[in-house]
């Protein structure tokens, strides 16, 4: 059977256009050629396969649909628009597939999708409108309720001459169309910072991980109207110190548990208000494994045992005394 | 200190419906996502649903599927199951337990760290 | 869903032997694996979580290893308060799942 999928041009309309009606519906029992399918599971696998395009042909019935491990390096508007629509596809994994690109409006005409998962692809240009649609002012919402964006850091040398962190976080802004994710992975991604106004269209977050990204500090970010939030992970990270304004925003979530392994915390006196948090909050489990790794005299200790008279600066000499 | 008190259990005919209540003392209640857990007479333990602090999500075993609803109402530190369509074989006890996650998508596992005491729910004619 | 396969599913032992439980995964679980001990007419108690920590307030005779597909419980030397029925249990995939016990009775 072919593997041609088509791929309507950037003016899509809201209704998959009339050329899709050009390829034969699939038959019922149908299965893409290098694929499994089960109607029984409703399950497509594709697994594998070095497929360069989304098959044409996948079964109306498929409810998740497994695309990893292939060569697809761009994702086009309506990659998934068929006649009949694929009413009932819900989870959508493509990691691991080579993608560079993933267009605006890629998952139109997917009106039950509720996870995807890109993890693993080299993203260096993901459309603003990637979620949102291609026409964002006329598209609703998106059904997605879990999004996974583990690793998906392009190779330096393949970086757009933009903030990757800002790429990402406007396809998360637009449109407001993800107002209703619960689950975001952002895993891995080297970020350096969270844009300021990253989370502000995501009220219905529940677990958001960035585990494993570059994170120096929490400074910029606003977690206030997460009220919704269950666990939110910033382990291995390069966290120095978390300072009170994010404390107190953490701490006025009713829901929320945060996850602070592996960073590298400097002990110095700027710690002691995290320090006190930490004694009387039950928001950080593990927190007892909590441990400095600057000064170097206070390697190893663990925060919850220092108290004030541990954590001291060194005094900052009078700028006529500083040298370069 | 922290602890669950049950309630609710009971004899109930097939087909009928019960309603159990674990209040939750000690501990912020909204910070934890609870589970029922059930032991038929001289069976081993079967996880029978979860619900994560908020309140938000939850899950069921597929033997309880469309029957049992997980709830839990944060002012009042209650955690409820609404059991439905009732057969033979939901026989149990039944106990809840505070769970060490928040989020029912977690990847840190701390145990189920307290139990309540169990209540005894028969399903017989 | 993941089947948890302990055994032995008795182990006859003395106060002061050393008893080692073993659960095995049908697939991995990486280290999202917990044990409970249970008493006649008890709820159970949580000793481990994560393969390998103990929980608050448990004595340091209980330890847990493993990884992956195969975990062990080890109690160095039974206490006359030992003797129960202990289970494994995974939250690595949905539903979370038990073992069906291993009884440590007294020889």
């Known amino acids: 059977s072919s593997l041609t999928s088509w791929a309507p041009s950037a003016a899509a309309s809201t209704s998959p256009p009339a050329s899709a009606a050009s390829a034969p519906p699939p038959l019922p029992g149908q299965c893409p050629q290098p694929c499994e399918c089960s109607e029984a599971a409703r399950t497509v696998k594709c697994v594998n396969r070095n497929l360069t395009e989304v098959p044409a042909d996948l079964p109306p019935y498929v409810r998740n649909l497994f695309l990893t491990g292939n060569q697809l390096a761009v994702l086009p508007p309506g990659a998934f628009a068929r006649r009949p629509p694929l009413a009932e596809l819900a989870a959508l994994n493509l990691s691991g597939s080579s993608l560079r690109e993933v267009c605006a409006g890629a998952f139109e005409h997917l009106p039950s999708l509720r996870q995807l998962d890109l993890s693993h692809n080299p993203l260096g240009n993901l459309s603003a409108f990637a979620f949102a649609g291609s026409d964002a002012s006329r598209s609703g919402p998106s059904p997605l309720v879990e999004l996974m964006l583990n690793h998906i850091v392009p190779p330096d040398d393949r970086r757009q001459n933009r903030s990757f962190e800002g790429m990402v976080a406007a396809a998360l802004r637009a449109g407001r169309a993800l107002r209703g994710l619960q689950c975001l992975e952002l895993a891995g991604n080297r970020f350096l910072y969270l844009p300021r106004d990253v989370l502000a269209q995501l009220p219905g977050l529940r677990h958001l991980d960035l585990r494993n990204n570059s994170l120096v500090s929490l400074t910029y970010v606003s977690f206030r109207n997460l009220t919704h939030l269950e666990s939110l992970h910033l382990e291995d990270n390069a966290l120095k110190v978390l300072h009170n304004a994010t404390l107190a925003e953490l701490q006025s979530l009713p829901h929320v548990r945060v996850f602070l392994d592996n960073n590298p915390w400097v002990c110095d006196c700027h710690m002691a208000d995290m320090v006190a948090w930490l004694k009387e909050t039950e928001v950080v489990p593990g927190k007892a494994g909590l441990t400095c790794a600057f000064p170097e005299k206070m390697r190893n200790r663990a925060l919850l045992e220092l108290n004030s008279s541990h954590l001291d600066c060194d005094p900052i000499l009078p700028p006529s005394l500083q040298t370069s | 200190q922290v602890q669950l008190v049950q309630s609710g259990g009971g004899l109930v005919q097939p087909g009928g419906s019960l309603r159990l209540s674990c209040a939750a003392s000690?501990?912020?209640?909204?910070?934890?996502?609870m589970s029922w857990v059930r032991q038929a007479p001289g069976k081993g333990l079967e996880w029978v649903s979860a619900i994560s602090g908020s309140g938000g999500s939850t899950h069921d075993a597929d033997s309880v599927k469309g029957r049992f609803t997980i709830s839990r109402d944060n002012s009042k530190n209650t955690l409820y199951l609404e059991m439905n369509s009732l057969r033979a074989e939901d026989t149990a006890v039944y106990y809840c337990?505070?769970?060490?996650?928040?989020?029912?998508?977690?990847?840190?596992?701390?145990?189920?760290?307290?139990w309540g005491q169990g209540t005894t729910v028969t399903v017989s004619s | 869903e993941i089947v948890l396969t302990q055994s032995p599913a008795t182990l006859s032992l003395s106060p002061g032997e050393r008893a080692t439980l073993s659960c095995r995964a049908s697939?991995?679980?990486?280290?999202?694996l917990a044990w409970y001990q249970q008493k006649p007419g008890q709820a159970p108690r949580l000793l481990i979580y994560d393969a390998s920590n103990r929980a608050t307030g448990i004595p340091a005779r209980f330890s847990g290893s493993g990884s992956g597909t195969d975990f062990t419980l080890t109690i160095s030397s039974l206490e006359p308060e030992d003797f129960a029925v202990y289970y494994c249990q995974q939250r690595s995939n949905w539903p979370p799942t038990f073992g069906q016990g291993t009884k440590v009775e007294i020889k």
């Open positions: 337990a505070k769970d060490g996650y928040s989020s029912l998508w977690d990847y840190h596992y701390y145990g189920m760290d307290v």
């Open positions: 000690g501990f912020t209640f909204s910070r934890n996502a």
């Open positions: 697939q991995s679980v990486s280290s999202y």
